[in-house]
């Protein structure tokens, strides 16, 4: 089995985690994709997912999580805005491929959010940013209930994360405020 590796990201409260999960576009472009948290001793829990089938570049928002699936590029972008200390944890991108188990998309991300002034750029950001607005209109998708505790046997393709301090124009609810509804028949 392939060893699961982690990337650690230390951010401040109020900042944004920006993760880019690469996938083989020919295989997975329209597949439903999800962002999961893995808590110690528990199965992965789906926090947000794209629509089924996934729509190209169409943002899906669940609380403070925003997913954008770029079919043309084979890239799923996940943002967690206005980070809170309690968001700290282990996360992963997966692709749903029923009836098979979800396919993990990258090295897992170990997110550590600490208290502190976030008015300055985070450790992975510089002054490159010029405009960053949270989209005012997004879709909330229904996510499958099932998760998989299995060890991934194929080499996991790819992701990365980037941080920023967004100029958010809307109030976002907590990521815990989600309803998990099965969508597979």
């Amino acid at each position: 089995a392939t060893k699961l590796t982690e990337e650690k990201y230390e951010l401040k409260e109020g900042q944004t985690l920006d993760v880019k999960c690469d996938y083989t576009l020919e295989k997975f472009a329209s597949s439903q994709k999800a962002w999961q948290i893995i808590r110690d001793g528990e199965m992965p829990k789906t926090l947000a997912c794209t629509e089924r089938p996934s729509k190209n570049s169409h943002p899906v928002q669940v609380g403070r999580i925003i997913l954008e699936d770029y079919h043309d590029h084979g890239l799923l972008r996940v943002r967690m805005v206005n980070l809170q200390v309690e968001d700290s944890g282990l996360y992963q991108c997966v692709i749903y491929q029923p009836p098979k188990e979800p396919h993990m998309l990258f090295d897992r991300i170990r997110l550590v959010v600490t208290k502190g002034f976030s008015g300055t750029p985070g450790s992975n950001e510089n002054s490159t940013q010029n405009v960053y607005k949270i989209p005012p209109t997004t879709t909330k998708a229904l996510c499958p209930l099932y998760t998989s505790p299995r060890t991934v046997t194929q080499a996991p393709p790819k992701s990365t994360a980037d941080v920023s301090t967004p100029d958010s124009e809307i109030n976002l609810t907590n990521v815990t405020d989600i309803i998990r509804v099965p969508v597979f028949n």
């Epitope: 570049s57 940013q129 393709p157 790819k158």
Partner: antibody, heavy 116, light 107 residues
């Protein structure tokens, strides 16, 4: 087939301005991030700027921030780069690129020469 | 800013041989790394993304590997059309940065 055609290059004096345009076809322009990448004569590639499909995110490399402005017109499938306060070191071939993080498709480039 | 360093600057290889190029990042870029090919007088072309995923239409003799800070790009058996300059690029953080390139020339 994806096509990106740059225009607007040419010779300009230091301190002058130039506006590059890129006509895009063969893909859904309004669903794609777009970028500008440049290449000085005999040198490597340098990313300049990227813009999200709806304009809600724009990023620049520090060396052009405040001088260059990326913009787009989704109705006309066009991308632009307004370049002000040009310097000799801005002399390069400027490529219009589909993609905001990595660069999926490239135009053939527009040569910008800054010289007195 | 993440600095990308490619080596060697020039690689002399005979047709049919294997070419192995290296790219090192000054800090971890996870697997968010792309490779491009640029032939003389032409625009670059995306070959690999996600460190190891081949872009559409790229032949199987081209491959990429690595994660974190060390990456490798390999052409298993060089063909005449493979002699070009190759660039790596990270897209983990802004600003997006590219390596200085490796020129693969005919030995």
């Amino acid at each position: 087939e994806v096509q990106l055609v740059e225009s607007g290059g040419g010779l300009v004096q230091p301190g002058g301005s130039l506006r590059l345009s890129c006509a895009a076809s063969g893909f859904t322009f309004s669903s794609n991030w777009m970028s500008w990448v440049r290449q000085a004569p005999g040198k490597g590639l340098d990313w300049m700027a990227s813009m999200k499909q709806d304009g809600s995110e724009i990023y620049y490399v520090d060396s052009v921030k405040g001088r260059f402005t990326i913009s787009r017109d989704n109705a006309k499938n066009s991308l632009h780069l307004q370049m002000n306060s040009l310097r000799a070191e801005d002399t390069a071939v400027y490529y219009c690129v589909r993609g905001g993080w990595r660069f999926e498709s490239w135009g053939q480039g527009a040569l910008v020469t800054v010289s007195s | 800013e993440i600095v990308m360093t490619q080596s060697p600057a020039t690689l002399s290889v005979s047709p049919g041989e294997r070419a192995t190029l290296s790219c090192r990042a000054s800090q971890s870029v996870s697997s968010n790394l792309a490779w491009y090919q640029q032939k003389s007088g032409q625009a670059p072309r995306l070959l690999i993304y996600g460190a190891s995923i081949r872009a559409t239409g790229i032949p199987a003799r081209v491959s990429g590997s690595g994660s974190g800070t060390e990456f490798t790009f390999t052409i298993s058996s060089l063909q005449s059309e493979d002699f070009a300059v190759y660039y790596c690029q990270q897209y983990k953080n802004w600003p997006l940065t590219l390596g200085g390139g490796t020129k693969v020339e005919i030995k």
